[in-house]
Amino acid sequence: MAVTACQGLGFVVSLIGIAGIIAATCMDQWSTQDLYNNPVTAVFNYQGLWRSCVRESSGFTECRGYFTLLGLPAMLQAVRALMIVGIVLGAIGLLVSIFALKCIRIGSMEDSAKANMTLTSGIMFIVSGLCAIAGVSVFANMLVTNFWMSTANMYTGMGGMVQTVQTRYTFGAALFVGWVAGGLTLIGGVMMCIACRGLAPEETNYKAVSYHASGHSVAYKPGGFKASTGFGSNTKNKKIYDGGARTEDEVQSYPSKHDYV
């Protein structure tokens, strides 16, 4: 039950996280104009990974896409790549994890296969979350660097009474969404990996063999043998729920859907 809950919760947390990563990637407010020097601006600038926008106090907002690839900073391209990789891995992870969910039966899929799929999706979620966190952090670092650079030469033209104030940018909402979403995806991935350990068949009970001693019958049953493969694809390492001694010719029954509660 705990395994199913952990797996289900991991899936839901990852789903929310990946939705957040997608939202953050699409958001325009990765960087927003710093209003410290001019809190009463009539023009507010903000930028995303794909376009930059200007919101006027009149109520009009004008957005322009970055219609160039070569002209964009390498760091921005790197952030885009990290976010897209994060989304793709997350999406594949979600697809895999749907089939790995314990509460969903797909044909005669064995638990070892589900365990493998759970681990795979968990790792994908972890990498996806790390990609998002890395992407957002790279962008944030870029902002901090540019912020202090523009602060150093805040007033570029001081000829006479004329001032040319450089626009500085600070953290936008998308960064916080990205960090939280990346963290959730990462946590979801870890939960899936933990659930995978619980899903993996850990013990193999050999078929009980009856030894007939003279005079009275004693059933000998060898102790449980720890499976060395953990959650490998060894289908022979199946748990046998035997109520007592069995004969040599008794057929081993595979676990039914009621065997794991």
Epitope: Q33, N38, V40, T41, A42, V43, N45, Y46, Q47, S52, C53, V54, E56, S57, S58, G59, F60, E62, R64, G157, V162, Q163, T164, V165, Q166, T167
Partner: antibody, heavy 118, light 113 residues
Framework: EVQLVESGGGLVQPGGSLRLSCAAS????????MHWVRQAPGKGLEWVSY????????YYADSVKGRFTISRDNPKNSLYLQMNSLRAEDTAVYYC???????????WGQGTLVTVSS | DIVMTQSPSSLAVSLGERATINCKSS????????????LTWYQQKPGQPPKLLIY???TRESGVPDRFSGSGSGTDFTLTISSLQAEDVAVYYC?????????FGQGTKLEIK
């Protein structure tokens, strides 16, 4: 046709109050930021106040801060300027104006004259 | 506050001649986000409210004759009337619409010589 019609002007004593109204027609007021601008007799234009489309952002000129209050009633398609503690230097024609692309004032009312005199 | 200074304060030009009005701001009105200058020009005739001529320093408002043009960037701007007509007699104002308070220039009175 877009129209802005101001009303509520008149003669008032120093220290008195007045409430100006601006009725909009031909467009939906709640899509635009709105301004009040005044012009003293024979003088230039002076911006007075601004209110954003959702009333979330409001600005005032230093000369009227603390005395004037801008507000709007979007369902009624109306803009208001409550003027308290009026002074002789507040005597002017008050215009309401609709903001446009580039923050420009694209449409202006005909204005209403406010005279502050004892 | 951004101070807007217009020159000249009055101008007399012959019909059909070019009229040029200058406007200088104490701070740059160029917005780096969209590379547009937040300066507007208005025309006000006696007894009438002002009329928008130019926004974004050089974009002509619809319905405004093409003899009116705006130019300039940063802190220095110009309104040009290529061929003065009798109906152009008015007071012209430039306005900072980049930062609050939205300040106006003192106005330039244009007359026919």
């Amino acid at each position: 046709e877009v129209q802005l019609v101001e009303s509520g002007g008149g003669l008032v004593q120093p220290g008195g109050s007045l409430r100006l109204s601006c009725a909009a027609s031909g467009f939906t007021l709640n899509n635009f930021g709105m301004h009040w601008v005044r012009q003293a007799p024979g003088k230039g234009l002076e911006w007075v106040s601004y209110i954003s489309s959702g009333s979330g952002t409001i600005y005032y000129a230093d000369s009227v801060k603390g005395r004037f209050t801008i507000s709007r009633d979007n369902p009624k398609n109306s803009l208001y300027l409550q003027m308290n503690s009026l002074r002789a230097e507040d005597t002017a024609v008050y215009y309401c104006a609709r903001a446009y692309y580039g923050n420009a004032f694209s449409f202006w009312g005909q204005g209403t004259l406010v005279t502050v005199s004892s | 506050d951004i101070v807007m200074t217009q020159s000249p304060s009055s101008l007399a030009v012959s019909l059909g001649e070019r009229a040029t009005i200058n406007c200088k701001s104490s701070q740059s009105l160029l917005n780096s986000g969209n590379q547009k200058n937040y300066l507007t020009w208005y025309q006000q005739k006696p007894g009438q409210p002002p009329k928008l001529l130019i926004y974004w320093a050089s974009t002509r408002e619809s319905g405004v004759p093409d003899r009116f043009s705006g130019s300039g960037s940063g802190t220095d701007f110009t309104l040009t009337i290529s061929s003065l007509q009798a109906e152009d007699v008015a007071v012209y104002y430039c306005q900072n619409v980049y930062s609050y308070p939205l300040t106006f220039g003192q106005g330039t009175k244009l007359e026919i010589k």
